[in-house]
């Protein structure tokens, strides 16, 4: 992190984003200060806002999983900022977390 | 040894209910989704159904919506296939299927489900 | 509903190429894997994320993905290649779709 408060997700997109123009995700956790655990998947290109999803989902788990056996991407991901994020929605905490892909990948 | 093995398949009459197991082992159960793929006899592979990590999010072939309900017992290392108002065309061998990402990694050996009068 | 198209037979001279298509409206945008199966056993993963090979599984095995079809290629074909090979894919729903199925058949 950067130091800056992170607007937290309180609510769930209803939409879903296609596997392959995701760049990678990062977690918000309510141990770190917000209110519901959410995964918000950063999308390849870097005008378009996060999309916050349900981390129970099954098709939040398949690209979880499909972007942890995916090598780290060379240039780190921005941490957590407050023109970054998607809802805004007044709450600030610091419930940002980033897994950009740090797991060993787990590919057959 | 990473390893599925499907089992409660049978001959069952149309409209009559079946519940298949998959017991899983050899790896950690709770961290992939599941799947059900049946493949009738000289035909092709069909997916029936998908659930995640927890059990929380399931979702279904249009074929079986309505009729099957899949589940998943974390503590037992066993996903389960509930199947309801069968019919001739459920037929088939019935394969669970490890998920990883975007494709099944492991499978078991399928149960054999007959349907007929 | 999506559907995936392949063709029922591809013929193939021992240690020769042979390529098996899969057909689906915008397959490209999804990640295709690809299955074998050989009489009386359970499938096998041969190719997943496209492109990328299971370990166990020849090099001779490789994939492509793009626009309206996925491609299986398998190089230096061996009568132990000889087998049904299908196709498959995840929508965003998400379910899945196999394709049809493709007998391969090593001649000589």
């Known amino acids: 992190s950067d130091g800056g408060a992170q607007d937290c997700c309180l609510k769930y997109s209803q939409r879903k984003i296609p596997a392959k123009v995701v760049r990678s995700y990062r977690k918000q956790e309510p141990s770190l200060g917000c209110s519901i655990p959410a995964i918000l998947f950063l999308p390849r290109k870097r005008s378009q806002a996060e999309l916050c999803a349900d981390p129970k989902e099954l098709w939040v788990q398949q690209l979880m999983q499909h972007l942890d056996k995916t090598p780290t991407p060379r240039k780190p991901v921005q941490g957590c900022r407050k023109d970054r994020g998607v809802p805004k929605n007044g709450k600030k905490g610091k419930g940002c977390k980033r897994t950009e892909q740090s797991q060993t990948p787990k590919g057959p | 040894e990473v390893q599925l093995l499907e089992s409660g398949g049978g001959l069952v009459q149309p409209g009559g209910s079946l519940r298949l197991s998959c017991a899983a082992s050899?790896?950690?159960?709770?961290?992939?989704?599941m799947s059900w793929v049946r493949q009738a006899p000289g035909k092709g592979l069909e997916w029936v159904s998908a659930?995640?990590?927890?059990?929380?999010?399931?979702s279904y072939a249009d074929s079986v919506k309505g009729r099957f309900t899949i589940s998943r017992d974390n503590s037992k290392n066993t996903l389960y296939l509930q199947m309801n108002s069968l019919r001739a065309e459920d037929t088939a061998v019935y394969y669970c299927?490890?998920?990883?990402?975007?494709?099944?990694?492991?499978w078991g050996q399928g149960t054999l489900v007959t349907v007929s009068s | 509903s999506y559907e995936l198209t392949q063709p029922l037979s591809v013929s193939v001279a021992l240690g020769q190429t042979a390529r098996i298509t899969c057909g689906g409206d915008?397959?490209?945008?999804?990640?295709a894997s690809w299955y074998q199966q050989k009489p009386g056993q359970a499938p096998v993963l041969v190719i997943y994320?496209?492109?990328e090979r299971p370990s166990g599984i020849p090099e001779r095995f490789s994939g492509s993905n793009s626009g309206n079809t996925a491609t299986l290629t398998i190089s230096r074909a061996q009568a132990g290649d000889e087998a049904d090979y299908y196709c498959?894919?995840?929508?965003?729903?998400?379910?899945?779709?196999f394709g049809g199925g493709t007998k391969l058949t090593v001649l000589g």
């Open positions: 050899g790896f950690t159960f709770n961290s992939y989704s």
């Open positions: 498959g894919s995840w929508d965003s729903n998400p379910t899945h779709v």
């Open positions: 994320d496209d492109n």
């Open positions: 299927a490890r998920g990883y990402g975007y494709y099944f990694d492991v």
């Open positions: 915008s397959i490209g945008s999804q990640y």
């Open positions: 659930i995640s990590m927890e059990g929380y999010s399931k």
